[in-house]
Interface confidence: medium
């Protein structure tokens, strides 16, 4: 599924991401935009042999199990394919674990490079939340 901007903002808010660990909803929507272009089925392969999955591009070396990433930790204890569902529950629950890990949203390269320090509230402007 490819979410609309406001549709995703509403879904993320419903799942408790607004101000989760101090990160406003705009940060999460911005991260999703630049990680996956709001596409729940996005997959991208990394040079270390791992793969990033889903709307928040969660990595198989650390967070999920895709059955083929050497030394996978699977810290979210889920199959990576669950992160590709049109229901973002699994991605949100795993993202909450990631953002609580110590580096906050810096764990997402796209957030660090494209969202951090910008007017992230623009990503939810005009949305009925």
């Amino acid at each position: 599924k490819v979410f609309g901007r406001c549709e995703l903002a509403a879904a993320m808010k419903r799942h408790g991401l607004d101000n989760y660990r101090g990160y406003s909803l705009g940060n999460w929507v911005c991260a999703a935009k630049f990680e996956s272009n709001f596409n729940t089925q996005a997959t991208n392969r990394n040079t270390d042999g791992s793969t990033d999955y889903g709307i928040l591009q969660i990595n198989s070396r650390w967070w999920c199990n895709d059955g083929r990433t050497p030394g996978s930790r699977n810290l979210c204890n889920i199959p990576c394919s669950a992160l590709l569902s049109s229901d973002i529950t699994a991605s949100v629950n795993c993202a909450k674990k990631i953002v609580s890990d110590g580096n906050g949203m810096n764990a997402w390269v796209a957030w660090r490079n494209r969202c951090k320090g910008t007017d992230v509230q623009a990503w939810i402007r005009g949305c009925r939340l």
Partner: antibody, heavy 116, light 107 residues
Framework: QVQLQESGAEVMKPGASVKISCKAT????????IEWVKQRPGHGLEWIGE????????YYNEKFKGKATFTADTSSNTAYMQLSSLTSEDSAVYYC?????????WGQGTTLTVSS | DIELTQSPATLSVTPGDSVSLSCRAS??????LHWYQQKPHESPRLLIK???QRMSGIPSRFSGSGSGTDFTLSINSVETEDFGMYFC?????????FGGGTKLEIK
């Protein structure tokens, strides 16, 4: 136990298309990548690409882009590879395998012969 | 693409001999290297994963070693059922690639 059952041998004319199937049993089909491998005598094994059945995500070896197309039907736990514009160079045994990085589980292979 | 070069192309041995098969990668692939045996008209069979981890059911005479670019499959005291083709495969990056194979034949 994990099993991959491929469709039977095919004899096709040059220029035609063929669709090979790979039915998976014994594991959660949507969770693992299915990979496709080509074997020709004297050419060893070549990785064609992969599909994640749960999402339909695909990756192709550059060499096979435009030649192979992967699909999957999660209702029947079956992956498919279509090969188009067949030539004699496509005559080979084609294997599906479960993508664990390594390949512990293989289909029995589908022999494709392209001949006029 | 990562190229895997296997040597020798053919190895002629007598049952009871011990042999070493080589697989060399064109760049470092850590331990992401796997070994297969293939008999005529059969699918490949995984022997060793991640350079040195023997798969369940594989006889202990098979062992793997190496890391980086140089890998070895050793067969201690070859048995008649061991004859066939041996391939290495890397999973360090895409596209996945295989070596050209080593044919183990009876002398």
């Amino acid at each position: 136990q994990v099993q991959l059952q491929e469709s039977g041998a095919e004899v096709m004319k040059p220029g035609a298309s063929v669709k090979i199937s790979c039915k998976a049993t014994g594991y959660t089909f949507t969770t693992y990548w299915i990979e496709w491998v080509k074997q020709r005598p004297g050419h060893g094994l070549e990785w064609i690409g992969e599909i994640l059945p749960g999402s339909g995500s695909t990756y192709y070896n550059e060499k096979f882009k435009g030649k192979a197309t992967f699909t999957a039907d999660t209702s029947s736990n079956t992956a498919y590879m279509q090969l188009s514009s067949l030539t004699s160079e496509d005559s080979a045994v084609y294997y599906c395998a479960r993508g664990d990085g390594y390949y512990c589980y293989w289909g029995q292979g589908t022999t494709l012969t392209v001949s006029s | 693409d990562i190229e895997l070069t296997q040597s020798p192309a053919t190895l002629s041995v007598t049952p009871g001999d011990s042999v070493s098969l080589s697989c060399r990668a064109s760049q470092s692939i850590s331990n992401n290297l796997h070994w297969y045996q293939q008999k005529p008209h059969e699918s490949p069979r995984l022997l060793i994963k991640y350079a040195s981890q023997r798969m369940s059911g594989i006889p202990s005479r098979f062992s793997g070693s190496g890391s980086g670019t140089d890998f070895t499959l050793s067969i201690n005291s070859v048995e008649t059922e061991d004859f066939g083709m041996y391939f290495c495969q890397q999973s360090n990056s895409w596209p996945r690639t295989f070596g050209g194979g080593t044919k183990l034949e009876i002398k």
